[in-house]
Interface confidence: medium
């Protein structure tokens, strides 16, 4: 039975040209995390594999940096970066846990961080 929960940075906003950290945290399970995938809609951004470390998809190498931790840093943000981001935790023996983050990239300086929330 899957008992874990994923806590994410939730709905967040950032300024165009700036950077943002996407963070997820898996709790309430003793399952071993073997890999974390970061995806934007259907595009793979990055992989953090327990044995092999980080792989950033070639098309995002210039603007995506690994970390901190299992998180992902997006740099040089554009309005086109607005949308849903998913952290997908592959675990053993539980299986797969998915967290969702919505990022809005704003033209002005009114960007504020949203509240944290949990996805069961």
């Amino acid at each position: 039975m899957m008992t874990g929960t994923i806590e994410t940075t939730g709905n967040i906003s950032a300024e165009k040209g700036g950077s943002i950290i996407l963070q997820c945290h898996l709790s309430s399970t003793t399952a071993q995390v073997t890999q974390v995938n970061w995806e934007q809609q259907d595009q793979l951004l990055a992989i953090c594999n327990a044995d092999l470390g980080w792989h950033i998809s070639p098309s995002f190498k210039d603007r995506v940096a690994p970390g901190p931790g299992l998180g992902l840093t997006l740099q040089s943000l554009t309005v086109n970066d607005t949308g849903e981001y998913f952290c997908i935790y592959h675990t053993y023996p539980d299986g797969t846990y998915t967290g969702r983050i919505f990022l809005e990239v704003l033209e002005s300086s009114v960007a504020e961080h949203g509240a944290r929330f949990q996805i069961p």
Epitope: Q35, H55, P58, H90
Partner: nanobody, 120 residues
Framework: EVQLVESGGGLVQPGGSLRLSCAAS????????MGWFRQAPGKEREMVAA????????LYADSVKGRFTISADNSKNTAYLQMNSLKPEDTAVYYC?????????????WGQGTLVTVSS
């Protein structure tokens, strides 16, 4: 039917080299993450290297970086692991796996493995 057949293992002295092969059938390597894993007696199976044929990206575990090289010959549908400067701690059964990074908690297809023994 998907089949993976490893070969090339054997007994080698410390500091020596071996080249492992993984002949794949039933699918094409193109578009797949292929991985080499190893399992030493009494230890968990660990991934040592993986390669993305479409992008050519290769990942290595810290313990083998600079000594092992993963490659492929798409015309032969075969993956390779060149192992140099071998150490006694490299002794293990080596396996190749298809879709190595798709979900590292569950692997659909495994070969039978090839034993590598590093000893003087």
């Amino acid at each position: 039917e998907v089949q993976l057949v490893e070969s090339g293992g054997g007994l080698v002295q410390p500091g020596g080299s071996l080249r492992l092969s993984c002949a794949a059938s039933g699918f094409t390597l193109s578009g797949n993450w292929m991985g080499w894993f190893r399992q030493a007696p009494g230890k968990e199976r660990e991934m040592v290297a993986a390669i993305d044929w479409s992008g050519g990206s290769a990942l290595y575990a810290d313990s083998v970086k600079g000594r092992f090289t993963i490659s492929a010959d798409n015309s032969k549908n075969t993956a390779y692991l060149q192992m140099n400067s071998l150490k006694p701690e490299d002794t293990a059964v080596y396996y190749c796996a298809k879709d190595a990074l798709s979900n590292s908690a569950r692997f659909d297809h495994w070969g039978q493995g090839t034993l590598v023994t590093v000893s003087s």
